[in-house]
């Protein structure tokens, strides 16, 4: 069974998948469609790296540009380094500028909805 066939079988169970499962799935060559990706739990999507999302979505990663204003895509973009976003070839903007440190302060993030940044 190839990755795409496997994805079709598990698609209906993915809604509540934790980050760890999504990371594992990204190694399976599944080419998740964007509609399914956007139904995933936001808290499960946010920790994924650009490389992991690229592997998870495969060719459908191109659709992030079309859906950049919608959650969880918008929130995920804000968490990524701009350098990493640039590798997607989509002209996505809003990532963390080069040279900034991301502090994972859970309380700060819970209050503001965005990560805390320290300038260079």
């Amino acid at each position: 069974m190839n990755g795409s066939e496997y994805f079709v079988k598990i698609q209906s169970f993915l809604g509540g998948a934790p980050t760890e499962d999504l990371k594992a799935l990204s190694q399976q060559n599944v080419s998740m469609d964007l509609a399914t990706f956007m139904k995933l739990r936001t808290d499960a999507v946010l920790p994924l790296t650009v490389a992991e999302v690229q592997k998870l979505l495969g060719p459908h990663v191109e659709g992030l540009k079309a859906e950049e204003r919608h959650r969880p895509v918008r929130d995920w973009i804000l968490r990524q380094r701009q350098d990493d976003l640039d590798t997607l070839g989509l002209g996505l903007q809003g990532g963390i500028p080069n040279g900034y440190l991301v502090l994972d302060l859970s309380m700060q993030e819970a209050l503001s909805g965005t990560p805390c940044l320290l300038g260079p």
Epitope: A35, M38, G58, H60, E62, G63, E67, G89, L90, G91
Partner: antibody, heavy 117, light 113 residues
Framework: EVQLVQSGAEVKKPGASVKVSCKAS????????MHWVRQAPGQGLEWMGN????????YYNERFMSRVTMTVDKSTSTAYMELSSLRSEDTAVYYC??????????WGQGTLVTVSS | DIVMTQTPLSLSVTPGQPASISCKSS????????????LAWYQQKPGQSPTLLVY???TRESGVPDRFSGSGSGTDFTLKISRVEAEDVGVYYC?????????FGGGTKVEIK
Amino acid sequence: EVQLVQSGAEVKKPGASVKVSCKASGYTFTNYWMHWVRQAPGQGLEWMGNINPSSGDSYYNERFMSRVTMTVDKSTSTAYMELSSLRSEDTAVYYCARSGGLWLAFWGQGTLVTVSS
Amino acid sequence: DIVMTQTPLSLSVTPGQPASISCKSSQTLLNSVSQNNYLAWYQQKPGQSPTLLVYFASTRESGVPDRFSGSGSGTDFTLKISRVEAEDVGVYYCQQHYRTPYTFGGGTKVEIK
């Protein structure tokens, strides 16, 4: 103004390979994916695959998986599509098309590839 | 693969009259989160490359005359030309970009009576 200028018509023998080029101008080449679509004479459109011009990652329609290679040259803002083991059914006009998000917003003028012995 | 079925195959229209083209997909093209339908319409005039008319099922591409309109959701979509003009002659294609391989309808040829 966005422009996609493709290479000229080609005549190839069965079993040979063809490489079609698509030179882009009028926009930032690495910010938009490039797709390739073909159209056999008098027929409809068939999506062949797409490529991320920033990383060079490409994705192909399984129908062409073993025969197609898509590449880019960022220094010249040019995309390439190579199709090998040509057969008569590959006679078609091959188009490059720049993505607008997912949809195909700009198309090249097309390159006619004729496969004939 | 998602199958796209277009009807009619061809259409002969009197100038100034409306025209309607149907496109049905074998599975939903709706993103239920964003409410976007992943469907585009293209026009291909004789001897030319295709051009984009509509994306997200109903968003008209800039520069496209407002006599063209797209509608529909899920699996059933329609392209309407409110008043056909001589320059509208050509073949019209729908395309899904929900899941690869992205597939096109078979095309609808529009002719002038």
